[in-house]
Interface confidence: medium
């Protein structure tokens, strides 16, 4: 017996061939003898079936001894044994119709579990196999569950379901709903105004939601909301702000905050919520700030750093052209009586700068100009 | 009989293109999972990329940005499109077959043979 | 990425005589995905075993695959002259699918 796999909602075409090359008669059965469609002359006739409005058979292809059943908008209980009965001769095709779901919705946060059920006909047993996006490959049954939903999983599915030998594929589209960045850090010179931007990793038509700032900075005990913002239709509307600082966020999306100017006192590390409408969970996103200040206090040049730089951060204090006079991987560094000339104080990373703040020293005595 | 035979090795300059071609024949093309592999002289296999039944494709970070995978089912023929070529790349080419369900590279090519000097 | 690790990477050993490969992953490798092969000098890759265990078509039955997670064995039982050759393991389970180095066994 010939088995065909089929996919629910798909269309599928089962052949019947005669050895004559010529428009005979032929009838199209299943398993319990109803007929399903035939032919009468050149007119196609059909019986009682359940199938009567989705069965279909391809004239133009009778004339060379071909007679399919043709069975559109597939259903998991169209899975039986379909008989064509032609010159005196029965063929039998067993047709196994199969669906693969996703869990709920197939937009799911970042961390969140997929699962994809199979749908198989009774007596039938399939085994199922999916490839992600990334190249990751999973097995299962009836159920496939894929914990822990990283960004890279976003993207087509891509399920094939065995039986019998025989496979059918399936392509299954996974939106993961993250941020493009778990995490970023902003380096600003005190006083300078500071962008934090963040884009979201996913485009749906409608996104509506609420999300938080929450801030915690180096220098307090604990953490602050500095904002609270409503999301609707990708417009953003700000609820709740504080007056120090006075963050202004834009008015559409990418997400985006400006602190007017970076100080000391905000030096440090945030963490933006944001909950979407009918999801459960949220988005988090991470971000630092690292502020630099460079100053002269009589015969001291200090240059410090707040906010959180990893031990392996250089602070260097240098005249302009020369060689660093201090560098140490500690958040404050200094000269005592240093030369006249434009300081350099820098923060950098294996050689690659990543903040610098210019400080002039004045000569302590002036020469008088040559007539 | 099932066969793999490539085609479009050669020398080529740092920096230029080549495409490789695998022609397929004596099983049902479209069905299989077609994998690229490479083998420098004297060393051990180097998975290139993979193509799946779906047109889903896949490659190592070595490779990633500059070559592409490729396949043409109505003419059973897989492809490797090769730019920004660099000395590491010189090896022999294998085409091979994986069947998506039994992971494994049961059908191999002969190689041809991709030599990238100035 | 999953590397994968072979030893020996040598094997000096007689015809006739048991050979024992390991392959070693650095993540557990579900066991579907990983699979054998045998290259002789001048030769294409000849798949010998897949899903950890299982022969591939027209491969003998001295030749048995096993192990789970991260350890995996290919066991020659008794080797023939023309078993004589470089062994790679290789696994599917995330892209890149990574190859062992190879095992060379070789007439002692």
């Known amino acids: 017996k010939k088995v065909v796999l089929g996919k629910k909602g798909d269309t599928v075409e089962l052949t019947c061939t005669a050895s004559q090359k010529k428009s005979i008669q032929f009838h199209w059965k299943n398993s319990n003898q109803i007929k399903i469609l035939g032919n009468q002359g050149s007119f196609l006739t059909k019986g009682p079936s359940k199938l009567n409005d989705r069965a279909d058979s391809r004239r133009s292809l009778w004339d060379q001894g071909n007679f399919p059943l043709i069975i559109k908008n597939l259903k998991i209980e169209d899975s039986d044994t379909y008989i064509c009965e032609v010159e005196d001769q029965k063929e039998e095709v067993q047709l196994l119709v199969f669906g693969l779901t996703a869990n709920s919705d197939t937009h799911l946060l970042q961390g969140q579990s997929l699962t994809l059920t199979l749908e198989s006909p009774p007596g039938s047993s399939p085994s199922v196999q999916c490839r992600s996006p990334r190249g990751k490959n999973i097995q299962g049954g009836k159920t496939l569950s894929v914990s822990q939903l990283e960004l890279q999983d976003s993207g087509t599915w891509t399920c094939t379901v065995l039986q019998n030998q025989k496979k059918v594929e399936f392509k299954i589209d996974i939106v993961v709903l993250a941020f493009q960045k778990a995490s970023s850090i902003v380096y600003k010179k005190e006083g300078e105004q500071v962008e934090f931007s963040f884009p979201l990793a996913f485009t749906v038509e409608k996104l509506t939601g609420s999300g938080e700032l929450w801030w915690q900075a180096e220098r307090a005990s604990s953490s602050k909301s500095w904002i609270t913002f409503d999301l609707k239709n990708k417009e953003v509307s700000v609820k709740r702000v504080t007056q120090d600082p006075k963050l202004q966020m834009g008015k559409k999306l990418p997400l985006h905050l400006t602190l007017p100017q970076a100080l000391p006192q905000y030096a440090g590390s945030g963490n933006l919520t944001l909950a979407l409408e009918a999801k459960t969970g949220k988005l988090h996103q991470e971000v630092n700030l690292v502020v630099m200040r460079a100053t002269q206090l009589q015969k001291n040049l200090t240059c410090e750093v707040w906010g959180p730089t990893s031990p392996k951060l250089m602070l260097s204090l240098k005249l302009e052209n020369k060689e660093a006079k201090v560098s140490k991987r500690e958040k404050a560094v200094w000269v005592l009586n240093p030369e006249a000339g434009m300081w350099q104080c820098l923060l950098s990373d294996s050689g690659q700068v990543l903040l610098e703040s210019n400080i002039k020293v004045l000569p302590t005595w002036s020469t008088p100009v040559q007539p | 009989e099932v066969q793999l035979v490539e085609s479009g090795g050669g020398l080529v300059q740092p920096g230029g293109s080549l495409r490789l071609s695998c022609a397929a024949s004596g099983f049902t093309f479209s069905s299989y999972d077609m994998h690229w592999v490479r083998q420098a002289t004297g060393k051990g296999l180097e998975w290139v990329s993979t193509i799946g039944t779906a047109g889903d494709t896949y490659y190592p970070g070595s490779v990633k940005g500059r070559f592409t995978i490729s396949r043409e089912n109505a003419e059973n023929s897989l492809y490797l499109q090769m730019n920004s070529l660099r000395a590491g790349d010189t090896a022999l080419y294998y085409c091979?077959?994986?069947?998506?369900?039994?992971?494994?590279?049961?059908?191999w090519g002969q190689g041809t043979t991709v030599t990238v000097s100035s | 990425e999953i590397v994968l690790t072979q030893s020996p990477g040598t094997l000096s050993l007689s015809p006739g005589e048991r050979a024992t490969l390991s392959c070693r992953a650095s993540q557990s490798v579900s066991s579907t995905y990983l699979a054998w092969y045998q290259q002789k000098p001048g030769q294409a890759p000849r798949l010998l075993i897949y899903?950890?265990?299982n022969r591939a078509t027209g491969i003998p039955d001295r030749f048995s695959g096993s192990g789970s997670g991260t350890d995996f064995t290919l066991t020659i039982s008794r080797l023939e002259p023309e078993d004589f050759a470089v062994y790679y393991c290789q696994q599917f389970g995330t892209s890149p699918f990574t190859f062992g180095p190879g095992t060379k066994v070789d007439i002692k």
């Open positions: 091979a077959r994986g069947d998506y369900y039994y992971y494994g590279m049961d059908v």
């Open positions: 899903g950890a265990s």
